[in-house]
């Protein structure tokens, strides 16, 4: 992890890197390694891809152990096969306005994510896609016997699936915070990012947090009850410690993770919160990292790799996270 010890490289000559990933000398000048890519975790030994203008952002001067590969100021973004300049805004579809900032794309919904609570006039509120309309709209399913134009007497439990409005006005600054992106890993420790100008200078900045949708070692399919197709949020029996590049969380956590389905759906975080986690490293150094904690998960067909890149990301976004 650090360069104080002697050089020790794997027996095989050089690793085979995936297409588009550079083979570089590690940060200690010892071994050839596959360079870490945008948004991946990096260390002194695991450098970021210099050919893509990436550097290891450790977040704070105190923490020099583990960082996130970040694009240098002004780096462009590649989104849906198109290159955008840093600072450039574009519409990825009729639903989203996106901004490229130093290699990271943050998108704001153009469609209202407004909630509708049941009322006598609309006991069964639903958001539906209407022909010829880009944004989903609220419709109220009427009870069979309702013919009047006034209210209907029925009750209905609407799941609170729509998160808070991410925009607000503050002292000459339209505060805009994009949703947290989906976790970069479907299992194990990954990174989730967002773009915000919620700061004193009202300048766009990137924020990142660690995330773990589920542990890689868990065989969750075994726990699916007979006749069921999904296990949305499996019960975690014992508190766990998180591991991050050889460092271990100081506290133990009874964290929730998302389950799996056997019918092609994927289960992803639905409501989350962000909390700081302290990690202690073998050399005694302690570092603090923000981490996503899952409150609830949702199982759906909008899985990674669907046609609209952002659509699949967006429907897997983290609702209701104000941190």
């Amino acid at each position: 992890q650090n360069c104080s010890g002697p050089c020790r490289c794997p027996a095989e000559q050089a690793p085979r890197c995936p297409a588009g990933v550079s083979l570089v000398l590690d940060g200690c000048g010892c071994c050839r390694v596959c360079a870490k890519q945008l948004g991946e975790l990096c260390t002194e030994r695991d450098p970021c891809d210099p050919h893509k203008g990436l550097f290891c952002d450790f977040g704070s001067p105190a923490n020099r152990k583990i960082g996130v590969c970040t694009a240098k100021d002004g780096a462009p973004c590649i989104f849906g096969g198109t290159v955008y300049r840093s600072g450039e805004s574009f519409q990825s579809s009729c639903k989203y306005q996106c901004t490229c900032l130093d290699g990271a794309v943050g998108c704001m919904p153009l469609c209202s994510m407004d909630v509708r609570l049941p009322s006598p006039d609309c006991p069964f509120p639903r958001r539906v896609k209407l022909p010829g309309k880009c944004c989903e709209e609220w419709v109220c399913d009427e009870p069979k016997d309702q013919t009047v134009v006034g209210p209907a007497l029925a009750a209905y439990r609407l799941e609170d699936t729509f998160g808070p409005d991410p925009t607000m006005i503050r002292a000459n600054c339209l505060v805009q915070t994009t949703e947290w992106s989906a976790c970069s890993k479907t299992c194990g420790m990954g990174i989730s990012t967002r773009v915000t100008n919620d700061n004193a200078s009202c300048r766009l900045e990137k924020q990142s947090r660690l995330c773990m949708v589920r542990p890689c070692e868990a065989d969750l399919e075994e726990n699916i009850k007979k006749g069921k197709k999904c296990i949305r949020t499996p019960k975690i029996s014992k508190p766990i410690k998180f591991e991050l590049s050889g460092c271990t969380s100081v506290k133990t956590y009874r964290a929730k993770f998302c389950g799996v389905c056997t019918d092609g759906r994927c289960c992803t975080p639905h409501r989350t919160t962000t909390l700081p986690v302290e990690f202690k490293c073998p050399d005694g150094e302690v570092m603090k990292k923000n981490m996503m904690f899952i409150k609830t998960c949702a199982c759906h067909y909008n899985c990674p790799g669907d046609n609209d890149i952002f659509e699949s990301l967006y429907y897997r976004k983290m609702y209701g996270d104000m941190a």
């Epitope: 609570l117 049941p118 009322s119």
Partner: antibody
């Protein structure tokens, strides 16, 4: 962003008619109903009337003969008229969106005095 | 005339749990009354917290929950925070009209 804003006279003379307008944005009056509620100084909230998304109306029976609620969906406005005003009608008048009374206007204070 | 009654005031310590209730003078409150809970913090506008008995608005923290309890509508706050100090009103629907309760002034000690 959902907003509701009440407007109307600050001072009304007894026996006169009060006309209040609620101008909404961020949602359509064809999708959500709008309620009028008032709060006399130091007292509790009092529900007055509602115009539902499809144009139906309901009123507080205690005021039914004095109240009329209407809307202009294209202008995103809901209008409440209250006839024969009396000093006891002095209050802050609010409009609120239907569906859990989730969004409210800031209110407009109306004083009834000669 | 239908009357909706709330506790005039309640006091709770930070981190504690408190239940505000909303009683109807004409019988048990049911889901057809679409119980709503509205909050007003000092110097701020009203905003809805709960609609349709138990549905939270997007800004309503999970520590707030709406339910029916012993024939009354109830708003339970678990793990009360100092910022929960406010006036809380319930509103019940009676086929043709809503009736608001008198409001509960919730004080958070400390």
């Amino acid at each position: 962003e959902v907003t509701l804003k009440e407007s109307g006279p600050v001072l009304v003379k007894p026996t006169e008619t009060l006309t209040l307008t609620c101008t909404v944005s961020g949602f359509s009056l064809s999708t959500f109903g709008v309620h009028w509620i008032r709060q006399p100084p130091g007292k509790a909230l009092e529900w007055l009337a509602v115009i539902w998304r499809r144009g139906g109306t309901d009123y507080n029976a205690a005021f039914m003969s004095r109240l009329t609620i209407s809307k202009d969906t294209s202008k995103s406005q809901v209008v409440l008229t209250m006839t024969n005003m009396d000093p006891v009608d002095t209050a802050t008048y609010y409009c609120a969106r239907d569906g859990g009374f989730d969004y409210w206007g800031q209110g407009t204070t109306v004083t009834v005095s000669s | 005339e239908t009357v909706v009654t709330q506790e005039p005031s309640l006091t709770v310590s930070p981190g504690g749990t408190v239940t505000l209730t909303c009683r109807s003078s004409i019988g048990a409150v049911t889901t057809s009354n679409y119980a709503n809970w509205v909050q007003q913090k000092p110097g701020q506008a009203f905003r809805g917290l709960i609609g349709g008995t138990s549905n939270r608005a997007p800004w309503t923290p999970a520590r707030f929950s709406g339910s029916l309890l012993g024939g009354k509508a109830a708003l339970t706050l678990s793990g009360v925070q100092p910022e929960d100090e406010a006036e809380y009103y319930c509103a019940l629907w009676y086929s043709t009209h809503y009736v608001f309760g008198g409001g509960t002034k919730l004080t958070v000690l400390g």
